[in-house]
C-alpha cells in the first residue's frame, strides 16, 4: 500500500518495526515538501535479508524519474549496499521510498528505522541553467530565491533577465555617437531600447558603425534572437545582427528611428554607430578685401555659419551699415543668406572742437581714417593745455580718436592766468595819486554794477572784482552785499547783478564783455561790523572768450601770512580819482567824479603791526583781522576809493613769472582816502584759496601747476 | 497805478492771533520788498519788518521777532502779516507798503478783552 | 538801532512863509558804496496811510510839488515847505532806511 507524507520531516519504519517485518510485504512512502525545498533521508537503524543486488527484500529511493538509491542486507558488500551513515537527498521535493520483503525469510530480520526531513535548496549556488539563473544578482532564502539587478537596469517581468529602459533617446545635434546599453560590456537581456535622431528639415543623416559589431544571431534563421532595426519613415532597414557590421547607411532623411531588440538570454557585445547630419553644399566663399571669414574650410554645408571680420582698423560696411562683424549661413537649399560683405576703413570723422582750442591735421587731406593723426592745442598766449598734454590724437581701430593720457576724453584748455598781454610797467608814478592804465593792462579788472530792484527806488552801485577763469569773478563780499538792513547779510539777487570785463573808459561799453551773473557767493562768515571775511564770488552766466583784454589773475598759494611787508603791489580801479574831492562833493555831483579811464596806483604792504596800531589809535571801533593787510603810504597821496571796492592788489610772482591777486580792496579809515596815516585795508586772499576753488568747484591741483610753473 | 488794499477791521482778545491780508497789483508783486508798519491811536509810526514775496526773504524789527510771522502768495500778489500773543497795546493801524513809497489804506486791530 | 530825532515837535507858521523841519540820527546815514543818504520823509494826514515826500535825503517823488525839499547829509537832515499852503497841515516824519528802518517821533504843522 502507499503513504502520503507532507510534513516537513518524519519517521519511517519497516512494518511491525522494530520486530521481524513480514514476508511478502510492500509498502510505499510518497514524501512531498514545498517547492524550493529537498528531502534529506537517512537511516538510524537497518537490518535487510540479503540478495544478490537486492532482489530479495530491499528498500528502494526514488523521485518521478530517477532511482536515487537501492538499499539491502545488514552492512555493506560488494553487490548489496546498505544506507549506513549515507543521506539521500532528494533533487527536488518529492521523494518516493518503497520497502519490498519477499515470499521467503529464512531468519528474522528486525527491518529498517528511517527519519526525513525538508532542506532548503540554495538555488543561487545550484542553478546552473541560464534559462532559470539570475542575470545579475541572485538572493537565497529557506525556501526559495529571487533575482535583482544591477543600478540603471530593471528586472523584467520574468523576475530572472535584467533589461534597461531605453526607448526614450533623442538626438537633435548634427553628429552624434549611440551604443547599445553598456557598450563594449554585454548588452541587456530582455530589452527594447528606441533611438531617435530628429535633426532640423535640410539635413540628411548618415550612419556608420563602428567597432565592435556583435549582436546574437542563429546560424539558420536570420536574427532571430536579438537585433537592430532602423526605421527611415516607411521603410524598415534591418534585421541586423551578428558580428558583421552593417555598410554605411545614407537615410537621405532628417529623422531616423533605431530598434534595438534583445531576449532573455545570451553574452554579446553589442555595438556602437556614429551618425553626421548632411546638407546642401554652399558655393566657395572669398574674404573680402582686408578682412577674413572663420572659420575657413574648403566646403561649407546647410546650417554652416560663417563670421565675417575685417582687419584691425576696418568696418564691415553691409548696406551702408557698419558693424564689427556679420554673419551668413549656409541654408538648405544651398545658398548663402547674404552676400559677402565689405571691408571700409574706420572713419573717425570730424574731431571735437576744442572749447579754446584749435585742432591740425598731420595727415594730409585733411584725413580722418584709421591711423590718422591731428593735434589739439589751446589758443594761446590765453590758453594753455592742462597738464602739458601733447595734444596728438590717432584716429583708432574703434573709430574714436585717441590720446595715450586722456583715452577719448578731450584736453582741456585752461585759462592762462597772471599774464597781461602788455606787460606793467615798472615805474608807476607816485584811483588818488594814480595813473590811467593801458587796455589790456589790467586785462582781469572788472567792473560790477548792482542794480537793486527790490527797493522802492532802486539802489545802484559798483564796485570791481577780479577774473579768475572763464566763468568766475572774484570780489569783496561788501559789493554784493543788499545795501539796505546792515544788521543781515543778504547776497543781492544774481539778476540785479552786470559784469562788465575787457573795460577800459566807462563811458565806452561797447569793446567790452558784459556778462549777467549765474550765482553770487558771499563768504558764509563775512562779518558787516568789521569788514572780516570781507570775499566773494560771481559765476558768470556764460564764461567769457580770453584775449589781450579779458584774462584771469592767478590765485596765491594757501599762506596764512600772506604777503610779505613792504612788497610791492598794484590794484587798478574806476574810483574816485581826485583827493580833494570831498563826501558832499560826491552826493551832489553823482558819479561824476568816478574816473572815465581805468586808474591804478602801486601801494607797498604794511608791516600788520603797524597798520592794527594805526587803526587803533583811531576813534572807532576798527578791527584789522588775520583776514586782512593794509597796503599805502604813511604820507599818504595814493590809496585805493570808493568805487574800488572788490578789485584786485596783485604782487608779481617771481617764481611763477605771473601776477598773483593777494588782496581785494575792502574798506578804509574814518578820513578821506590818501590821507596821512590812513592805510588801506584789503581782503588776504591767500587765506581762502581753499574756499575759492571749492566753491568754483574745482581741486586746487588742477589750476595750482598754472600759477606754480 | 501801484495798489496796496489791505484787509478790514479786526477786533481780538488778548492772547489771540491776527492775520492781516495786502493786496498788491500794478507792479510786479515778486520783486519788491513788502514792509509792515504800525501806528497806535494818536502815536508815531513804528516799523515792524518786511518780505521779499520772490524769494521768501524776511528782515524783522527785534521788538517783533518771535510774535510777527510774514508770508507772501504769489499766485494771488497778497502779502501776509500774522501777530500772536496780542495785548491791548499791540491796538493800532498796521500798514503794509511796498518798499518806501506806496501804502495801503491801513487795517485797525482792536486789542481787548 | 538807530535812533531818529525831529524838531520841533510841532511847529505854526503862515500861509506863505517857510517850515523848516530839522531831523538828526544818532548814526551816518551815507552808504558809502552808493553814494547815498538812506532818509525819506513822510506827510501824514488825519485819518490817511503816510504819503512819501522825499527819498535819499534831497530827491522829490514824482508829483510832490517844488515847495518841498529836502537837505543834508550824513546825520542832520532838514525838510523844507518855501511857502506853506493850507493843505500842507499835517503830520510830518522822517524814516531812515540805512538799517533796520527806524522813524522820528513826527513834527506837527499848523497855520499860525
Known amino acids: 500500500h502507499t503513504v502520503e507524507l507532507n510534513n516537513m520531516f518524519g519517521q519511517i519504519q519497516s512494518p511491525g518495526y522494530p520486530d521481524s517485518y513480514p514476508s511478502d510485504s510492500e509498502v510505499t512512502w510518497n514524501i512531498t515538501v514545498p517547492d524550493g525545498f529537498r528531502i534529506k533521508l537517512y537511516f538510524m537503524h537497518f537490518n535487510l535479508e540479503s540478495s544478490y543486488l537486492c532482489e530479495y527484500d530491499y528498500v528502494k529511493v526514488e523521485t518521478e524519474d530517477q532511482v536515487l538509491a537501492t538499499f539491502c542486507g545488514r552492512e555493506t558488500t560488494d553487490t548489496e549496499q546498505t544506507p549506513g551513515q549515507e543521506v539521500v537527498l532528494s533533487p527536488g521535493s518529492f521523494m518516493s521510498i518503497t520497502f519490498r520483503s519477499d515470499f521467503s525469510n529464512e531468519e528474522r530480520f528486525t527491518g529498517f528505522d528511517a527519519h526525513y526531513m525538508a532542506v532548503d535548496v540554495d538555488e543561487c549556488k545550484e542553478r546552473e541553467d541560464e534559462e532559470l539563473s539570475c542575470d545579475h544578482y541572485c538572493h537565497n532564502y529557506i525556501g526559495g530565491y529571487y533575482c535583482s539587478c544591477r543600478f540603471g537596469y530593471i528586472l523584467h517581468t520574468d523576475n530572472r533577465t535584467c533589461r534597461v529602459e531605453c526607448s526614450d533617446n533623442l538626438f537633435t545635434q548634427r553628429t552624434g555617437v549611440i551604443t547599445s546599453p553598456d557598450f563594449p560590456n554585454p548588452y541587456p537581456k530582455s530589452s527594447e531600447c528606441l533611438y531617435t535622431i530628429e535633426l532640423e528639415e535640410g539635413f540628411m543623416v548618415n550612419l556608420q558603425f563602428e567597432d565592435i559589431f556583435d549582436i546574437e544571431d542563429h546560424p539558420e534563421v536570420p536574427c532571430p534572437y536579438d537585433y537592430i532595426k532602423i526605421k527611415v519613415g516607411p521603410k524598415v532597414l534591418g534585421p541586423f545582427c551578428g558580428e558583421k557590421a552593417p555598410e554605411p547607411i545614407s537615410t537621405q532623411s532628417h529623422s531616423v528611428l533605431i530598434l534595438f531588440h534583445s531576449d532573455n538570454s545570451g553574452e554579446n557585445r553589442g555595438w556602437r554607430l556614429s551618425y553626421r547630419a548632411a546638407g546642401n553644399e554652399c558655393p566657395e566663399l572669398q574674404p573680402p578685401v582686408h578682412g577674413k571669414i572663420e572659420p575657413s574650410q574648403a566646403k561649407y554645408f546647410f546650417k554652416d555659419q560663417v563670421l565675417v571680420s575685417c582687419d584691425t582698423g576696418y568696418k564691415v560696411l553691409k548696406d551702408n551699415v557698419e558693424m564689427d562683424t556679420f554673419q551668413i549661413e549656409c541654408l538648405k537649399d544651398g545658398t548663402w543668406s547674404n552676400k559677402i560683405p565689405t571691408c571700409k576703413i574706420v572713419d573717425c570723422r570730424a574731431p571735437g572742437e576744442l572749447e579754446h582750442g584749435l585742432i591740425t591735421f598731420s595727415t594730409r587731406n585733411n584725413l580722418t581714417t584709421y591711423k590718422s593723426e591731428i593735434k589739439y592745442s589751446c589758443q594761446e598766449p590765453y590758453y594753455k593745455m592742462l597738464n602739458n598734454n601733447t595734444g596728438i590724437y590717432t584716429c583708432s581701430a574703434q573709430g574714436v580718436w585717441m590720446n595715450k593720457v586722456l583715452g577719448r576724453s578731450l584736453p582741456t584748455c585752461l585759462p592762462e592766468c597772471g599774464q597781461p598781454s602788455r606787460s606793467l610797467p615798472s615805474l608807476v608814478k607816485r584811483i588818488i595819486g594814480g595813473r590811467n592804465a593801458e587796455p589790456g593792462l589790467f586785462p582781469w579788472q572788472a567792473l560790477i554794477v548792482v542794480e537793486d530792484t527790490s527797493r522802492v527806488p532802486n539802489d545802484k552801485w559798483f564796485g570791481s572784482g577780479a577774473l579768475l577763469s572763464a566763468s568766475w569773478i572774484l570780489t569783496a563780499a561788501h559789493v554784493l552785499r543788499s545795501q539796505r538792513r546792515d544788521t543781515t547779510v543778504i547776497p543781492v539777487s544774481k539778476e540785479h547783478v552786470t559784469v562788465y570785463l575787457g573795460l577800459h573808459d566807462v563811458r565806452d561799453k561797447s569793446g567790452a564783455v558784459n556778462s549777467s551773473a549765474a550765482r553770487v557767493v558771499l563768504h558764509p562768515d563775512f562779518n558787516i561790523q568789521n569788514y572780516n571775511h570781507d570775499i566773494a564770488l560771481v559765476q558768470l552766466q556764460e564764461p567769457v572768450p580770453l584775449g589781450p583784454h579779458v584774462m584771469p589773475v592767478c590765485l596765491p598759494r594757501l599762506e596764512p601770512e600772506g604777503p610779505a611787508p613792504h612788497m610791492l603791489g598794484l590794484v587798478a580801479g574806476w574810483g574816485i580819482s581826485n583827493p580833494n574831492v570831498t563826501v558832499d562833493e560826491i552826493i551832489s555831483s553823482g558819479t561824476r567824479t568816478l574816473s572815465d579811464v581805468l586808474q591804478y596806483v602801486k601801494l607797498p604792504v604794511v608791516p600788520h603791526a603797524e597798520c592794527k596800531t594805526s587803526y587803533e589809535s583811531r576813534s572807532g571801533n576798527y578791527s584789522v583781522t588775520e583776514n586782512m593787510f593794509c597796503a599805502g603810504y604813511y604820507e599818504g597821496g595814493k590809496d585805493t576809493c570808493l568805487g574800488d571796492s572788490g578789485g584786485a592788489f596783485v604782487i608779481f610772482d617771481d617764481l611763477s613769472q605771473r601776477w598773483v591777486v593777494q588782496g581785494l580792496v575792502s574798506w578804509g579809515g574814518p578820513e578821506e582816502c590818501g590821507s596821512k596815516q590812513v592805510y588801506g585795508v584789503y581782503t588776504k586772499v591767500s587765506n581762502y584759496v581753499d574756499w575759492v576753488w571749492e566753491q568754483m568747484g574745482l581741486p586746487q591741483s588742477v589750476v595750482e601747476p598754472q600759477v606754480e610753473r | 497805478q501801484v495798489q496796496l488794499v489791505q484787509s478790514g477791521a479786526e477786533v481780538k482778545k488778548p492772547g489771540a492771533s491776527v492775520k492781516v491780508s495786502c493786496k498788491a497789483s500794478g507792479y510786479t508783486f515778486t520783486g519788491k520788498w513788502i514792509e509792515w508798519v504800525r501806528q497806535a491811536p494818536g502815536q508815531g509810526l513804528e516799523w515792524i519788518g518786511e518780505?521779499?514775496?520772490?524769494?521768501?526773504?524776511?528782515n524783522y524789527n527785534e521788538k517783533f521777532k518771535g510774535r510777527a510771522t510774514f508770508t507772501a502768495d504769489s499766485s494771488t500778489s497778497t502779502a501776509y502779516m500774522e501777530l500772536s500773543s496780542l495785548r491791548s497795546e499791540d491796538t493800532a493801524v498796521y500798514y503794509c507798503l511796498r518798499s518806501e513809497d506806496v501804502w495801503g489804506q491801513g487795517t485797525l486791530v482792536t486789542v481787548s478783552s | 538801532d538807530i535812533v531818529m530825532t525831529q524838531s520841533p515837535d510841532s511847529l505854526a507858521v503862515s500861509l506863505g512863509e517857510r517850515a523848516t523841519i530839522n531831523c538828526k540820527s544818532s548814526q551816518s546815514l551815507l552808504a558809502s558804496r552808493t553814494r547815498k543818504n538812506y532818509l525819506a520823509w513822510y506827510q501824514q494826514k488825519p485819518g490817511q496811510p503816510p504819503k512819501l515826500l522825499i527819498y535819499w535825503a534831497s530827491t522829490r517823488e514824482s508829483g510832490v510839488p517844488d515847495r518841498f525839499s529836502g537837505s543834508g547829509s550824513g546825520t542832520d537832515f532838514t525838510l523844507t515847505i518855501s511857502s506853506l499852503q493850507a493843505e500842507d497841515v499835517a503830520v510830518y516824519y522822517c524814516?531812515?532806511?540805512?538799517?533796520?528802518?527806524?522813524f522820528g517821533q513826527g513834527t506837527k504843522v499848523e497855520i499860525k
Open positions: 524814516k531812515q532806511s540805512y538799517n533796520i528802518p527806524t
Open positions: 518780505i521779499l514775496p520772490g524769494t521768501g526773504s524776511t
